[in-house]
């Protein structure tokens, strides 16, 4: 346990500020799997990469958290860093 | 609708380079087709910040750049061979998620020949 | 880096038919596949994104499935105007790969 944390939180640290706003945003309509609640905006907003990843794992739990990170990354064409993401969550 | 601007042909002797540009804006990919061919992804560049992805196969004879200023991102290929006489695309990832190829530049046609 | 094999190469069919185009990607892709429409002398159109989406302005004659590895484009009743190149692309991981298409020829 914690080691999805820990990549999710080093992915969002890489993002720059300008990517981090962006990634937020895009959660706020990414596709969820079935019965998955979306994060409040209001929280979301201002966030930083620390405080987002504690709100990803307690809202989605560790495992969707990540692929959920992971897809967010993905649609920002940040491939390499989702596929780096999910290799650290996998190992 | 969001148009790609292109310049429609080049011609190029071999050995030599030659330099694509696309008035675009986001995640600008650029994509090979080969007469009667499938598409090629090249690599793309995210004209905001400047961050690039290259596929290998192409790494040592395409740099992609951009002039933020003027929105435009630029391939050029160098050292170039009739393997290179291609249809070159440029494209935009603009839809919101799952990051697919939106919006098409009409391609630029570079020939290679002596 | 991750091969999409596109089958059948060619397909010669009638005005009406419907028809169902496979895309298959060498490892796990999600659903990160697009469909591409490609009529000659053309560049490529998006129809279908995340593997089922209808890209804006796409006839609902266009249906995209699948996930994982395993992707399907449906046409249910083909036009004239739809006798083109179909693509597929996968943008899961980079390098962005495409299929080497699918051509759709009148009968």
């Known amino acids: 346990m914690g080691r999805a944390r820990d990549a999710i939180l080093d992915a969002l640290e890489n993002l720059t500020a300008e990517e981090l706003k962006k990634f937020k945003l895009k959660l706020l309509s990414v596709p969820l799997r079935e019965a998955a609640g979306r994060i409040p905006r209001g929280a979301l907003l201002s966030m930083d990469a620390l405080d987002l990843t504690d709100k990803l794992v307690s809202f989605y739990l560790e495992t969707y958290g990540a692929e959920l990170t992971a897809n967010v990354l993905r649609d920002m064409g940040l491939q390499e860093m989702a596929g780096q993401l999910q290799a650290a969550t996998h190992q | 609708q969001v148009q790609l601007q292109q310049p429609g042909t080049e011609l190029v002797k071999p050995g030599a380079s030659v330099k694509l540009s696309c008035r675009a804006s986001?995640?600008?990919?650029?994509?090979?087709?080969?007469?009667?061919?499938?598409l090629e992804w090249i690599g793309n560049i995210n004209l905001s910040n400047g961050r690039t992805n290259y596929n290998?196969?192409f790494r040592a004879m395409a740099t992609l750049t951009v002039d933020k200023s003027s929105s435009t991102a630029y391939t050029q290929l160098s050292s170039l061979t009739s393997e290179d006489s291609a249809v070159y695309y440029c494209?935009?990832?603009?839809?919101?998620?799952?990051?697919?190829?939106?919006?098409w530049g009409q391609g630029t046609s570079v020939t290679v020949s002596s | 880096n991750i091969v999409m094999t596109q089958y059948p190469k060619s397909m010669s069919l009638s005005i009406g038919e419907r028809v169902t185009l496979r895309c298959k990607a060498s490892?796990?892709?999600?659903?990160?596949v697009s469909w591409y429409q490609q009529k000659p002398e053309q560049s490529p159109k998006l129809l279908i994104y995340?593997?089922?989406n209808r890209y804006t302005g796409v006839p609902d004659r266009f249906t995209g499935s699948g996930s994982a590895t395993d992707f399907i484009l449906t046409i249910t009743s083909v036009q004239a105007e739809d006798l083109a190149d179909y693509h597929c692309?996968?943008?899961?991981?980079?390098?962005?790969?495409f299929g080497a298409g699918t051509k759709l020829e009148l009968k």
């Open positions: 494209a935009n990832s603009m839809v919101p998620h799952f990051f697919p190829m939106d919006y």
């Open positions: 986001g995640w600008t990919h650029w994509v090979k087709q080969r007469p009667g061919q499938g």
């Open positions: 290998e196969k």
């Open positions: 490892e796990n892709v999600g659903s990160y």
């Open positions: 995340g593997a089922s």
């Open positions: 692309g996968q943008s899961y991981n980079y390098p962005l790969t």
